[in-house]
Amino acid sequence: IPVIEPSVPELVVKPGATVTLRCVGNGSVEWDGPPSPHWTLYSDGSSSILSTNNATFQNTGTYRCTEPGDPLGGSAAIHLYVKDPARPWNVLAQEVVVFEDQDALLPCLLTDPVLEAGVSLVRVRGRPLMRHTNYSFSPWHGFTIHRAKFIQSQDYQCSALMGGRKVMSISIRLKVQKVIPGPPALTLVPAELVRIRGEAAQIVCSASSVDVNFDVFLQHNNTKLAIPQQSDFHNNRYQKVLTLNLDQVDFQHAGNYSCVASNVQGKHSTSMFFRVVESAYLNLSSEQNLIQEVTVGEGLNLKVMVEAYPGLQGFNWTYLGPFSDHQPEPKLANATTKDTYRHTFTLSLPRLKPSEAGRYSFLARNPGGWRALTFELTLRYPPEVSVIWTFINGSGTLLCAASGYPQPNVTWLQCSGHTDRCDEAQVLQVWDDPYPEVLSQEPFHKVTVQSLLTVETLEHNQTYECRAHNSVGSGSWAFIPISAGAHTHPPDEFLFTP
């Protein structure tokens, strides 16, 4: 904490005196106090010196010294009285601005502490204070009107008794402002409106504030509408309401409507759009692709956006096959309303099973008719592989069948030794089959391909492996020729359960 020299809480001097106030701290220090022309401020190392060689009543005040670098924010203060027999008051302000219910400090500082007993607060021209004015006095700070009210916005003077007569300060204007947190609060209902030509409509614009001084109007496409205003006062707020009633809407009523309210704090506005249509409408759309591919076992949410007026009379999700006649569980269907005319419908399909691939359709109905939106869901599977030894046209042939989705690619490997899976060190030959024969390819099903590897003579201490892969995964099957007949080995990890 900084230290002030002289180390007294208050100092009383006569006009014309030399005053030197020194503040010393650990780091740099700063003086704070009423800005005044009658001081000189200079630094001397870690101290700051405030001095005047001709003190006047205007130097009366509290001077505080702080250490800006001190995290604890410690400060020291000294109060200086310059007791001028002709000037009992040093008034630090022409005007004081506070909000209602705040304390209002009228900063007339007494220049001589001896005069404290005879001070009083009056309104200008000697008028007494208003009834219920609760105030206190501090010779260091002035008069405080506690919990000031708007009605106490007046011009005040501080009075001191000197030699049996009252000496007045210059006047201080007190402005007590009503607490207006901001522009009036606004509501405009509905937030959006759609009507068929000939129907009735109502738009309500209302504003409220703690202060009665505010304006509100409703405008249509930047044209101010002449609407009678209803006023009310409840919950300590003033309310102004404008109601636009339209018995039979037409296209010229469509457009942007703005509710605008303003007060001294500024302006608030909110807008809505009114759409007039010829007839009922129902539009279905999705942000998703209508053709979906998902890996078996994973989940999928199908989302449909519905725009409709009038509201929906019915809606449902339907599974159109081809695998079973099951229907989506109602608990998996979810509806959320974005606003009055737009809704989102979601069908959750968790942990998809092979039998759940196919077409899903969302159907909705309103007075405008039926609409449907259909998704096609194909499941992706990692390849399943099997290899057999056979003779085709008299030639020994290894036949590899691979089944999965998307369509698997096939690679043959020949490697030394007997193994469940060829590793790089053992590989003798690799054959890629760029065009395996497609055995089956139906919508929503796995694609089965077949690859043939013609082998003139089977090498008995070798393994022939068929590998298949697609974007989901890979599968393989090892074929081991043995003199007593051929052995085939699916790899351990092939045990696949969707």
């Epitope: 001081w39 401020l41 001077y63 400060s75 630090l92 005007e95």
Partner: antibody
Framework: QVQLQESGPGLVKPSETLSLTCTVS????????WSWIRQPAGKGLEWIGR???????KYNPSLKSRVTMSVDTSKNQFSLKLSSVTAADTAVYYC???????????WGQGALVTVSS | QSVLTQPPSASGTPGQRVTISCSGS????????VNWYQQLPGTAPKLLIY???QRPSGVPDRFSGSKSGTSASLAISGLQSEDEADYYC???????????FGGGTKLTVL
Amino acid sequence: QVQLQESGPGLVKPSETLSLTCTVSGGSISSNYWSWIRQPAGKGLEWIGRIYTSGSTKYNPSLKSRVTMSVDTSKNQFSLKLSSVTAADTAVYYCAREGIVGAFHYWGQGALVTVSS
Amino acid sequence: QSVLTQPPSASGTPGQRVTISCSGSSSNIGSNTVNWYQQLPGTAPKLLIYSNNQRPSGVPDRFSGSKSGTSASLAISGLQSEDEADYYCAPWDDSLNGVVFGGGTKLTVL
């Protein structure tokens, strides 16, 4: 380190009221004097007035009839309202902390306010 | 029109010493202390000198202030290109009961 930041509308219509707020950060607004100063484009600086945290104000006599300053210690903010503005009030408005010898040690970056219809 | 008179412009070459004057009256410079501000292009003013001749921390000692009677002056020695700015004197004015600013001097480093 004390920092000041002016905010408010950049455009005000003639005859309306200009309103600006200064937010003080890095220190308390309490026990200090806070001033507004303005500078028309290409011209010099003009002191508008000062406010103490208790709400005490002193204004430049040339602007006194149109100026109101207020302070909100709970938000560490003080504000300026200048009524009945004209094109002559178009300027960059600065808020600043006024020290004991009338020196402005800390300044905001300034807010340009244009008065135009 | 400012009650304080400053030359509208001043110039100097790097390394040179330049002085900017500020002339006032008994109600401002004559009876009160003077502060000086530097305003670099496009920025807020910065306190350069307070109480006639005191430098805030961070201001180089190339800058010095003095006062005599109803006039004050700011001296910049060892002029540098980054000193190119507007300079304002600002004493307290008793009739204003606040600070009054000079018209400003534009310093150009040639």
